[in-house]
């Protein structure tokens, strides 16, 4: 039994790091393999992750990590019974994929503005909480040519769009994703999209 593609890991910088790898042949990951991980830190303990199958030769493991901070470094040991298949290390802060924002809501009751709000996916005491910026994607299923990305570089998870910039009488969808500038993260997954109908009409000019 051997590793074909070494484990690569990403962290949500909160509680979970996900490691994926490929084996040299079909493998029952949960029955045959164990990924042991330990924080390189005083009085830390070794933890065991039971991997799941991810396709025929692929395995994935979700490592539970508490209080993730920038200096953290983990040793990783992939075992098949008594055989050490691979040994490596993982620094979560250098491989961050933020959690997706949640609770995306569209407020259309503000006279001439479409207000989008969503929730920061991290609690206030998490180090990413004040570092997230967002991208909001708005598109229309009625108008396939219309798709816009709005970059939200301020901290407040809101976006205001003049309703007049959208076509009246058609439906729009929006979704949002996040990244953290100071941690040089990848983008999060997109949030679930939300749909609304733009009923705004320009005031009649005399």
């Amino acid at each position: 039994m051997k590793v074909l593609q070494e484990p690569t890991c990403v962290s949500d910088y909160m509680s979970i790091s996900t490691c994926e790898w490929k084996m040299g042949g079909p493998t029952n990951c949960s029955a045959e393999l164990r990924l042991l991980y330990q924080l390189v830190f005083q009085s830390s303990e070794t933890h065991t992750c039971v991997p799941e199958n991810n396709g025929g030769v692929g395995c994935v493991c979700h490592l539970l990590m508490d209080d993730v901070v920038s200096m953290d470094n983990y040793t990783l040991d992939l075992w098949a019974g008594q055989q050490l298949l691979w040994k490596g290390s993982f620094k979560p802060s250098e491989h961050v994929k933020p959690r997706a924002p949640g609770n995306l809501t569209v407020h259309t009751n503000v006279s001439d503005t479409v207000l989008l709000t969503w929730s920061n996916p991290y609690p206030p005491d998490n180090y990413l909480y004040n570092d997230l910026t967002y991208a909001v994607n708005i598109w229309s299923e009625n108008d396939p040519a219309y798709s816009r990305i709005h970059n939200v570089t301020y901290l407040k998870p809101t976006l205001r769009i003049p309703a007049s910039t959208l076509k009246s009488g058609i439906s729009y969808r929006a979704r949002v994703r996040a990244w953290a500038q100071h941690y040089n993260t990848t983008w999060s997954e997109w949030s679930p999209s939300t749909k609304w109908y733009n009923s705004y009409r320009e005031p009649f000019e005399q």
Epitope: S43, S44, E45, D67, V69, S70
Partner: antibody, heavy 116, light 111 residues
Framework: QVQLVQSGAEVKKPGASVKVSCKAS????????MHWARQAPGQGLEWMGI????????SYAQKFQGRVTMTRDTSTSTVYMELSSLRSEDTAVYYC?????????WGKGTLVTVSS | QSVLTQPPSVSAAPGQKVTISCSGG????????VSWYQQLPGTAPKLLIY???KRPSGIPDRFSGSKSGTSATLAITGLQTGDEADYYC????????????FGTGTKLTVL
């Protein structure tokens, strides 16, 4: 919100032991390391050791090896620091502090006075 | 015994800027991240800066940190009377064993 509530002030005689408690609330107790540090009157901060509340494993500063014992009780979310063979120079405010490489939450401190 | 050296005291008038230095060596600041703590009279220390230059939630941007080589600096702009306190730098030392260490402390007086 995170709170670390420490036990009250103590007056001890030289040679005695003192046990200071630090009760945690507002977070998952076993998910965060706890440090102990002390500060003698008018002096700076001195690290004493660390405990991992998850498994109870500890690491102590060389200076306090053999004299300090850190324990935890997960049922009450409390960590303890016991210092034995007290001497006058152990008179200090003792702090528990949550974190790993830096400490974001601190208890208010417990004054331990060692005097004959 | 602290191996991080800070000036014993600094002072400046309200509204001014002040910097506090923290000098170490290759086995500590040179090889680790620096944090800064503020200790108001009669209270526990409070984290101001971590990772050399990051601020926890709730710390105003008047406080900033930087690191260069084996030294670190805390800068406070727009000084307020409420900033009068002791300030400590902290980091990890790897010699002879891994351990957290603190600076000697700096008393900031707002004139």
């Amino acid at each position: 919100q995170v709170q670390l509530v420490q036990s009250g002030a103590e007056v001890k005689k030289p040679g005695a032991s003192v046990k200071v408690s630090c009760k945690a609330s507002g977070y998952a107790f076993t998910s965060y390391y706890m440090h102990w540090a002390r500060q003698a009157p008018g002096q700076g901060l001195e690290w004493m050791g660390i405990i991992n509340p998850s498994g109870g494993s500890t690491s102590y500063a060389q200076k306090f090896q053999g004299r300090v014992t850190m324990t935890r009780d997960t049922s009450t979310s409390t960590v303890y620091m016991e210092l034995s063979s007290l001497r006058s120079e152990d008179t200090a405010v003792y702090y528990c502090a949550r974190g790993k490489w830096w400490w974001q939450h601190w208890g208010k401190g417990t004054l331990v006075t060692v005097s004959s | 015994q602290s191996v991080l050296t800070q000036p014993p005291s600094v002072s400046a008038a309200p509204g001014q800027k002040v910097t506090i230095s923290c000098s170490g060596g290759s086995s500590n600041i040179g090889n680790s991240y620096v944090s800064w703590y503020q200790q108001l009279p009669g209270t526990a220390p409070k984290l101001l800066i971590y990772d050399n230059n990051k601020r926890p939630s709730g710390i105003p941007d008047r406080f900033s940190g930087s690191k260069s080589g084996t030294s670190a600096t805390l800068a406070i702009t727009g000084l307020q009377t409420g900033d009068e306190a002791d300030y400590y730098c902290g980091t990890w030392d790897t010699s002879p064993v891994d351990r957290p260490i603190f600076g000697t402390g700096t008393k900031l007086t707002v004139l």
